[in-house]
């Protein structure tokens, strides 16, 4: 039962994270939550950084600055892969949840 519950939590978290991405950066509250998660967990996107390509409000050559290894204003514009966290947040935060929840 515990594994089923954990998988359900992960699935919900994945869906919720992707929903929040769709609202980025239009919704300031959403943006700050996502930015905090990406910066704190050193991750980018849901599955990986390429998820940001699919967000209509984001230019295809851009990720949020919170994806950058060294966060500075505008660092996510025309990003280089070596300058950003490439791993996805769902797996990274999911791993943390599995250990701590």
């Amino acid at each position: 039962a515990g594994y089923v519950f954990r998988d359900k939590v992960m699935s919900e978290f994945n869906n919720n994270f992707r929903q929040q991405m769709e609202n980025y950066p239009k919704n300031n509250h959403t943006a700050s939550i996502l930015d905090r998660m990406q910066a704190d967990f050193k991750c980018c996107g849901a599955a990986n950084y390429t998820d940001w390509e699919k967000i209509p409000s984001m230019s295809k050559n851009r990720v949020p600055d919170s994806c950058c290894i060294n966060v500075t204003v505008g660092c996510g514009i025309n990003f280089n892969e070596k300058a950003i966290h490439k791993e996805g947040c769902v797996e990274k935060i999911g791993g943390w949840l599995r250990k701590n929840v």
Epitope: T50, E53, S59, K60, N61, R62, G74, C75, I77, N78, F79, N80, E81, K82, A83
Partner: antibody, heavy 119, light 108 residues
Framework: QVQLVESGGGLVKPGGSLRLSCAAS????????MNWIRQAPGKGLEWVSY????????YQADSVKGRFTISRDNAKNSLYLQMNSLRADDTAVYYC????????????WGQGTLVTVSS | DIQMTQSPSSLSASVGDRVTITCRAS??????LNWYQQKPGKAPRLLIY???SLQSGVPSRFSGGGSGTDFTLTISSLQPEDFATYYC??????????FGQGTRLEIK
Amino acid sequence: QVQLVESGGGLVKPGGSLRLSCAASGFTFTDYFMNWIRQAPGKGLEWVSYISNSGAIKYQADSVKGRFTISRDNAKNSLYLQMNSLRADDTAVYYCVRDPRSYYGFDYWGQGTLVTVSS
Amino acid sequence: DIQMTQSPSSLSASVGDRVTITCRASQSIRNFLNWYQQKPGKAPRLLIYAASSLQSGVPSRFSGGGSGTDFTLTISSLQPEDFATYYCQQSYSNPPITFGQGTRLEIK
């Protein structure tokens, strides 16, 4: 020193195919996005395609979409452009170009290879 | 897509002259603007990046300015080797990466 050497250009008939190669040396290839940029005779510069460090991200100009495919082999420090269904307006010098990204500009260009599409 | 418009498209000047070329973007590109020089039969060469930063090895007579939508490339005192074609290019929003149409600088 940084070197980008293109090869594979030549004369091809309309509808034909060609594969351009670019051999990179003198720098860490995986640190850079790479581009193909072309210049038709007597005309300006036109971006054709780019590929990210790992090859996970690839984009083409609308004018070549569905016909040209960019790829890279990081083990061989090589960049490629597969060109299919070639048309007369694809005639140009094709440059292999290094891209540090951010706001740094295209800092190194190859000497170019001429592709001529004519019957 | 962001359009880049250069002016003038051609320009005649003499050695020693001060020359300014302008580039306008169809929307704000902050400072994500680069300038290139190209001589006949040669590959382009990066002169200025980030609107105003001089690329390593480029003479200090070249300078760039502007931000947002309006940019300039200035050559303070033209030298014989500066007669060439100059292009601006934006990297703020892509694809596509877009260039200006070029400015041909000729000897008067």
